[in-house]
Interface confidence: low
């Protein structure tokens, strides 16, 4: 009967054991939940810098290469050109670098998108019309919305396989594209109408290693 | 054809500033960078500096740091070296080269002016 | 900065025999992008350098055969095949992988 209480205690204290043990581990997973979320927030925020360093960039080259920089006297230019000159400089200190978790396939597919995109790229300065429609093409591939033309298939199977967040960054970088060319047109047609010349304005350069 | 075509030869007196310029023609002038670089006498070859012409955006060799101002002129497709408080050391020819091709592969030093002697001379 | 090293200083040769000149960088040269920007130049008496070979061995337009280039990381070799009068020179190597580019001291091809 001892023995038997004896028993009865030890199995209390197992099962007391055992329950807070579940107790712990339930705590520890919320508190995973939550830092689960927390890193994902830090995650979309670092994003965020990365996207708003990229938009100020572009933002300083367009002002750097507008019309109306063109419109002004040396001097102001040149003090225009320094601020701009400056800001960018700045804005090159700041550096986030949100790395992506890919599998090989993703990895694959990654490269394989970014190629498709250069090959464009390149082809801007021989043929800024058709580069344009391409990658609209490219850019219907990567869009939700309803295509305003023709969608490259076998790009948007092959942005399919890139990880999500990769699926997103080639969207910007074909919408940074799409405007830098819009520009770049506008800047055209304003030189062949004033003087019936033709200009290139695509900052884009596979190999920039200086900059 | 590509052209480099740059001005002619320099005599200063030191502490005096020249400005060397590079005339480009046969090629787009915002689509490639354009370097700098000096051969002293029984000295190697020295990079400067380089403009990239589409944005005036530059980078210096330390080495000439506040020695050196490089510019460029778009409507006349030219770009500019200026050297300040020259001292006998500076006398060197002076090169400009074409850079890379902002687009992709290709320039470096692929095309050259054809030197401008700066004699710093008292 | 990157120190690039070339030898021989002077190279005598044989119209007709081949000619080899060496270049060793301090670092190696490949770009985090992939290439190697290591490139040859040809300076004839009294004349601007003239790019021969970019990229470690791709020949620049216009540029004969007989020059070839070779190497990898920080180990350089520029080949002429079949040297010709016209090859008298001072031939450079130089690095364009890392700021500031720079150049090598130089190796003078004469006849004997």
């Known amino acids: 009967m001892a023995q038997a209480k004896i028993n009865a205690k030890a199995n209390e204290g197992r099962f007391c054991r055992s329950s807070s043990m579940a107790d712990r581990s339930s705590r520890l997973l919320e508190s995973l939940d939550q830092l689960e979320l927390r890193v994902e927030a830090l995650r979309e925020a670092a994003t965020a810098v990365e996207q708003e360093k990229e938009i100020l960039l572009e933002m300083i080259h367009s002002i750097q290469n507008s019309q109306d920089m063109r419109q002004i006297s040396d001097g102001e230019r040149e003090e225009l050109n320094l601020t701009a000159n400056r800001l960018m400089g700045r804005t090159l200190t700041v550096e986030v670098s949100v790395e992506t978790i890919r599998n090989p396939q993703q990895q694959e597919s990654l490269k394989h998108a970014t190629r498709i995109i250069d090959e464009v790229v390149n082809k801007f300065l021989d043929d800024l019309g058709n580069a344009k429609s391409h990658l609209m093409s490219l850019y219907s591939a990567c869009s939700s919305e309803v295509p305003h033309g023709p969608v490259d298939q076998k790009f948007q199977s092959i942005v399919i396989g890139c990880a999500l967040e990769d699926q997103k960054k080639i969207k910007r970088r074909l919408e940074t594209l799409l405007r830098n060319i819009e520009n770049s047109d506008k800047a055209i047609k304003l030189l062949e109408h004033s003087k019936g010349a033709g200009s290139k304005t695509l900052q884009q350069n596979a190999e920039s290693r200086f900059n | 054809q590509v052209q480099l075509v740059q001005s002619g030869a320099e005599v200063k007196k030191p502490g005096a500033s020249v400005k060397v310029s590079c005339k480009a023609s046969?090629?787009?002038?915002?689509?490639?960078?354009f370097y700098w670089v000096r051969q002293a006498p029984g000295q190697r070859l020295e990079w400067i500096g380089y403009?990239?012409?589409?944005?005036?955006?530059?980078t210096y060799n330390r080495k000439f740091k506040g020695k050196v101002t490089i510019t460029v002129d778009k409507s006349a497709s030219t770009a500019y070296m200026e050297l300040n408080s020259l001292r006998s050391e500076d006398t060197a020819v002076y090169y400009c080269a074409r850079g890379y091709y902002r687009y992709g592969g290709g320039g470096d030093f692929d095309y050259w002016g054809q030197g401008t002697l700066v004699t710093v001379s008292s | 900065d990157v120190v690039m090293t070339q030898s021989p200083l002077s190279l005598p040769v044989t119209l007709g025999q081949p000619a080899s000149i060496s270049c060793r960088s301090s670092q190696s040269l490949v770009h985090s992008n992939g290439n190697t920007y290591l490139h040859w130049f040809q300076q004839r008496p009294g004349q601007s350098p003239r790019l021969l070979i970019h990229?470690?061995?791709n020949r620049f337009s216009g540029v004969p055969d007989r020059f070839s280039g070779s190497g990898s990381g920080t180990d350089f070799t520029l080949k002429i095949s079949r040297v010709e009068a016209e090859d008298v020179g001072v031939y450079y190597c130089?690095?364009?992988?890392?700021?500031?580019?720079?150049f090598g001291g130089g190796t003078k091809v004469e006849i004997k």
């Open positions: 990229k470690v061995s």
């Open positions: 046969g090629y787009s002038f915002t689509d490639y960078t």
């Open positions: 130089s690095q364009n992988t890392h700021i500031p580019p720079t």
């Open positions: 403009i990239d012409p589409y944005n005036a955006g530059n």
